[in-house]
C-alpha cells in the first residue's frame, strides 16, 4: 500500500503519500477551530507509470494505452485512496463543541 | 457533474471528461477480444483550480491551502468518478464467452 509505512521510508518519485502539515490559521485562514492548531493532512503526488498501484480496470487499461502510445496525454493520476476523519474543538460563542470532520487526513494513495 | 453532457459540449481547460476511443488490437495489443473491436473508454484531464468539483473535505482543504500558499505543490488531481462496465465477447478455443469487464468506461470526473 502507498501509505506512510512505505512512502515515508522510501525516496519515491512515483505516486506516493507525501507529508503535509496544515496550520488552520496560517494555511487556511481559519480562526474558528480552537484545537488542534493544525494537523497532518498529507497529500498524494508522483508519477503513475505502467501499472503502478492502478486501482481500477480503467486505470490499468489507461496505463497500458500510455505505454503503447507514449505521446498520449491520457494518463492516470496520483490521488488519495484511504481517508480518515479529524476531531476538532471549536466554540459557538462561549460553548465548546467537538465535531468530527470526515475525510480530512489522507492515509494512502493510488493511481486512478 | 463533469460528465459527457457537460464536458463534451463546453471547451473546458479545467478537470473534465475527455473522449478517448481505445482500439483493443492497436492501442493495447490485445488480440483476444473478438467484439467489440474497441470502445469509448474516455479519460479525465484538466486543471483542478480552487474548489473545482472537489469531491472530499481533504480535496477542498487542499484547494484552499493552494490558494493561500500558491508556491505549494500539493494540489488536487483530475480523476474518474463514475465508471461503467463493458461487455465483451471472446473465445476460449472455439467456445464463445461473454464477459462483463468492470470499471472500463469513465462516465464522469472529479478533483481529488
Amino acid at each position: 500500500a502507498l501509505d506512510a509505512a512505505y512512502c515515508f521510508r522510501n525516496v519515491q518519485d512515483n505516486c506516493c503519500l507525501r507529508p503535509l502539515y496544515i496550520d488552520f490559521k496560517r494555511d487556511l485562514g481559519w480562526k474558528w477551530i480552537h484545537e488542534p492548531k493544525g494537523y497532518n493532512a498529507n497529500f498524494c503526488a508522483g508519477a503513475c507509470p505502467y501499472l503502478w498501484s492502478s486501482d481500477t480496470q480503467h486505470s490499468r487499461v489507461l496505463s497500458l494505452y500510455n505505454t503503447i502510445n507514449p505521446e498520449a496525454s491520457a494518463s492516470p493520476c496520483c490521488v488519495s485512496q484511504d481517508l480518515e476523519p479529524l476531531t476538532i474543538l471549536y466554540y459557538i460563542g462561549k460553548t465548546p463543541k467537538i465535531e468530527q470532520l470526515s475525510n480530512m487526513i489522507v492515509k494512502s494513495c493510488k493511481c486512478s | 457533474a463533469l460528465d459527457a453532457a457537460y464536458c463534451f459540449r463546453n471547451v473546458q481547460d479545467n478537470c473534465c471528461l475527455r473522449p478517448l476511443y481505445i482500439d483493443f488490437k492497436r492501442d493495447l495489443g490485445w488480440k483476444w477480444i473478438h467484439e467489440p473491436k474497441g470502445y469509448n473508454a474516455n479519460f479525465c484531464a484538466g486543471a483542478c483550480p480552487y474548489l473545482w468539483s472537489s469531491d472530499t473535505q481533504h480535496s477542498r482543504v487542499l484547494s484552499l491551502y493552494n490558494t493561500i500558499n500558491p508556491e505549494a505543490s500539493a494540489s488536487p488531481c483530475c480523476v474518474s468518478q463514475d465508471l461503467e462496465p463493458l461487455t465483451i465477447l471472446y473465445y476460449i478455443g472455439k467456445t464463445p464467452k461473454i464477459e462483463q469487464l468492470s470499471n472500463m468506461i469513465v462516465k464522469s470526473c472529479k478533483c481529488s
Epitope: L28 | V61, L64
Partner: antibody, heavy 120, light 108 residues
C-alpha cells in the same frame, strides 16, 4: 476591497419560495464564517443562520428552522439562503455578513441587503 | 436566548456633546462577546466596536466601548453631524446571536 452583494429579493405570496444569493469578493471567501441577518421594516436586526465554509456546518434561528436552508458554493464565492414556506413575518431586508473569524463573532462586512416582501 | 436591552431607545443631543448608550444582557457574556454597530438610513449596519472595547479598523477614536458581564456601554466623546444613526449592540457569547432593539441618535 471586501465586498458582499446580495440579490434575489422579491414580492412573494405566503407559502411561496425564494432563493437569496450573496456574492463575495476581495478576500479568501472560504476562510470566514458567513451569516444571514434580517431586518423587518422599521424594526431591529435579527440573526437568521450561519454556515462554516468548506466543512458545511450550518445553524439556524428557531423561527426559520425547517423552512430555510443556508448553503455555500465555495468555488463561486457565493452564499445562498433558500427560503420555503414563507410567512408574512419573514418580510424583511436580508443581509449577508462575514464574521471576524470565529463561528459566533462580530460581523465586520455586510452586504447592502435585499428586500423580501411576503404578502398576498 | 440572551435578551439584550438597550437604553435609551432614542436621544437627541447637540453637536460636540458626549453620547452614552448602555446595553444590558439577560445573562453574563463574559468580557469580550459584545459588538456595537452603526446603521444609517437605507444602509447596512457598520461594525464600530468588537470584543466590548476594540475599535474596528478605520473607526474614529471618538467611538469607544467598555463593560463586561451583563453591563456594557458605548460612548461617542464628541458628537458629529455624521453620527446621526441607529446604534445596535450585539452579543455573540451564545447561540442564537441577538441584538439590542437599537438606539436612535439625533442632533438637536
Amino acid at each position: 476591497d471586501v465586498q458582499l452583494v446580495e440579490s434575489g429579493g422579491d414580492l412573494v405570496k405566503p407559502g411561496g419560495s425564494l432563493r437569496l444569493t450573496c456574492v463575495a469578493s476581495g478576500y479568501t471567501f472560504s476562510s470566514n464564517v458567513m451569516h444571514w441577518v434580517r431586518q423587518a421594516p422599521g424594526k431591529g436586526l435579527q440573526w437568521v443562520a450561519y454556515v462554516i465554509p468548506i466543512v458545511d456546518i450550518a445553524y439556524y434561528a428557531d423561527s426559520v428552522k425547517g423552512r430555510f436552508t443556508i448553503s455555500i458554493d465555495n468555488s463561486k464565492n457565493t452564499l445562498y439562503l433558500q427560503m420555503n414556506s414563507l410567512k408574512t413575518e419573514d418580510t424583511a431586508t436580508y443581509y449577508c455578513a462575514r464574521t471576524l473569524g470565529l463561528v459566533l463573532d462580530a460581523m465586520d462586512y455586510w452586504g447592502q441587503g435585499t428586500l423580501v416582501t411576503v404578502s398576498s | 436566548e440572551i435578551v439584550m436591552t438597550q437604553s435609551p431607545a432614542s436621544l437627541s443631543l447637540s453637536q460636540e456633546e458626549k453620547v452614552t448608550i448602555t446595553c444590558r444582557a439577560s445573562q453574563s457574556l463574559g468580557s469580550s462577546y459584545l459588538a456595537w454597530y452603526q446603521q444609517k438610513p437605507g444602509q447596512a449596519p457598520k461594525l464600530l466596536i468588537y470584543g466590548a472595547s476594540s475599535r474596528a479598523p478605520g473607526v474614529p477614536s471618538r467611538f469607544s466601548g467598555s463593560g463586561s458581564g451583563t453591563d456594557f456601554s458605548f460612548t461617542i466623546s464628541s458628537l458629529e453631524p455624521e453620527d446621526v444613526a441607529v446604534y445596535y449592540c450585539q452579543q455573540y457569547a451564545d447561540s442564537p446571536i441577538t441584538f439590542g432593539q437599537g438606539t436612535k441618535l439625533e442632533i438637536k
